[in-house]
Interface confidence: medium
Amino acid sequence: IFPLAFFIYVPMNEQIVIGRLDEDIILPSSFERGSEVVIHWKYQDSYKVHSYYKGSDHLESQDPRYANRTSLFYNEIQNGNASLFFRRVSLLDEGIYTCYVGTAIQVITNKVVLKVGVFLTPVMKYEKRNTNSFLICSVLSVYPRPIITWKMDNTPISENNMEETGSLDSFSINSPLNITGSNSSYECTIENSLLKQTWTGRWTMKDGLHKMQSEHVSLSCQPVNDYFSPNQDFKVTWSRMKSGTFSVLAYYLSSSQNTIINESRFSWNKELINQSDFSMNLMDLNLSDSGEYLCNISSDEYTLLTIHTVHVEPSQETASHN
């Protein structure tokens, strides 16, 4: 038998919990351990989220939106744990939750403010549009609205466009920057202040290389230490721009240490890779190899783009044959 008696005044306290979209979270609530425990979780002081008394859940009047998504830590209730395990949070779950706990020795009302954030990994893209070159920082799904900043050669750029589309539960954002004719380095930072998560995209253009047909070219790609952490999973992709689109030459996955090469003349130095140097060699150059080569090192926290322009010129032999 679990009779009811709620005692002792404890001032209402408020905690903030930050969850990520579609992930599970815990809304904390503790109380002075005692017998006759009654726990009621409510949302916005109105909707019943979870009820427990007489030693078991009573979910008959639970609001349907919480069905199969809530549970308590049943083995720990006797130790004063009234926390709520909350599955698959959505942005609609944001708000104030009240935990009302009664025992034979106290009554407490705890408030938990749930904030939900979204931050699908952003990307930095390099695009050619007619004769113009653009860098685009974009994030497919983010909430709340992020702060986007651009720098050119480490100096903040005040002007930046932001193309925003809002859906029911998040924003999709593109921030394009026209870099036509520029040899500067660019950096784009996207910050989700709620999740305290920052992503940085960095773009560097290397000096143009002039090579003769049949020669080989070495293109450097070394991450900037400020961003790069070899302990974190990342991916390296080398691609070549052809008629406005990039084709992938090779990529490397740090998690599996796999290298996949799509171009037989492409080579990577395994020893250099182990030293976090992703420079590549392209052998036996031909005229059609002229163009832009892009090294993309990406993780959840950054994208580092390095562009090389290669000009392949006919060798003297070829020229004299013509």
């Epitope: 038998i1 679990f2 009779p3 009811l4 008696a5 709620f6 005692f7 002792i8 005044y9 404890v10 001032p11 209402m12 017998s35 006759e36 009654v38 409510k42 002081d45 109105s46 009820s51 008394y53 007489k54 009573h58 009047s61 009240t98 009302y100 034979a104 020795i105 009554v107 407490i108 009302t109 408030k111």
Partner: antibody
Framework: QVQLQQSGAELVRPGVSVKISCKGS????????MHWVKQSHAKSLEWIGS????????NYNQKFKGKATMTVDKSSSTAYMELARLTSEDSAIYYC????????????WGAGTTVTVSS | DIQMTQSPSSLSASLGERVSLTCRAS??????LSWLQQKPDGTIKRLIY???TLDSGVPKRFSGSRSGSDYSLTISSLESEDFADYYC?????????FGGGAKLEIK
Amino acid sequence: QVQLQQSGAELVRPGVSVKISCKGSGYTFTDYAMHWVKQSHAKSLEWIGSISTYYGDTNYNQKFKGKATMTVDKSSSTAYMELARLTSEDSAIYYCARGNYDDWYFNVWGAGTTVTVSS
Amino acid sequence: DIQMTQSPSSLSASLGERVSLTCRASQDISGYLSWLQQKPDGTIKRLIYSTSTLDSGVPKRFSGSRSGSDYSLTISSLESEDFADYYCLQYASSPYTFGGGAKLEIK
């Protein structure tokens, strides 16, 4: 049906004690806490305290500590409240009220016991 | 302790009239508020709990609502048996506290 039957009116002299009762029927007595409430002309309604009818644990409003003592007799399904060292300030109607789990407190009230302190 | 300030303390109204009583909480009580009715013979009955949930058997003309820290009881169309005293009660934390009461009289 659920009922709380309170003892009859009391006329007592200042300085003495009085013990009033509240008998629960129509439900499992030990499943619910019992609250006691004072109603005087000057102070509207005041919560005195509550008692766990199963464990006997008590909780008092600070203001009534030393004045009220709550007890319970499970065998007769009766809750008691004793008021000590009575003064004219204690003249009031005293109600017992039952707690509940899902719809909370004070969902069933007794009819009240009038206590008059007079010399 | 949480103070509950109830207004008005008395109110005269006619049969069929709509009336509202208000209680203001000095601290956040998260909707843990009941409305009680006391008849002239002293009988106390709970009408509403959790701000707006009607007890079984309570006529639909009674309703409860909340705006911030203000809690209201509304009777949409007064009937003769509604003339009584009304109290609000907070049970968010002990000591539980009551409003000063409102006497609803027939005009």
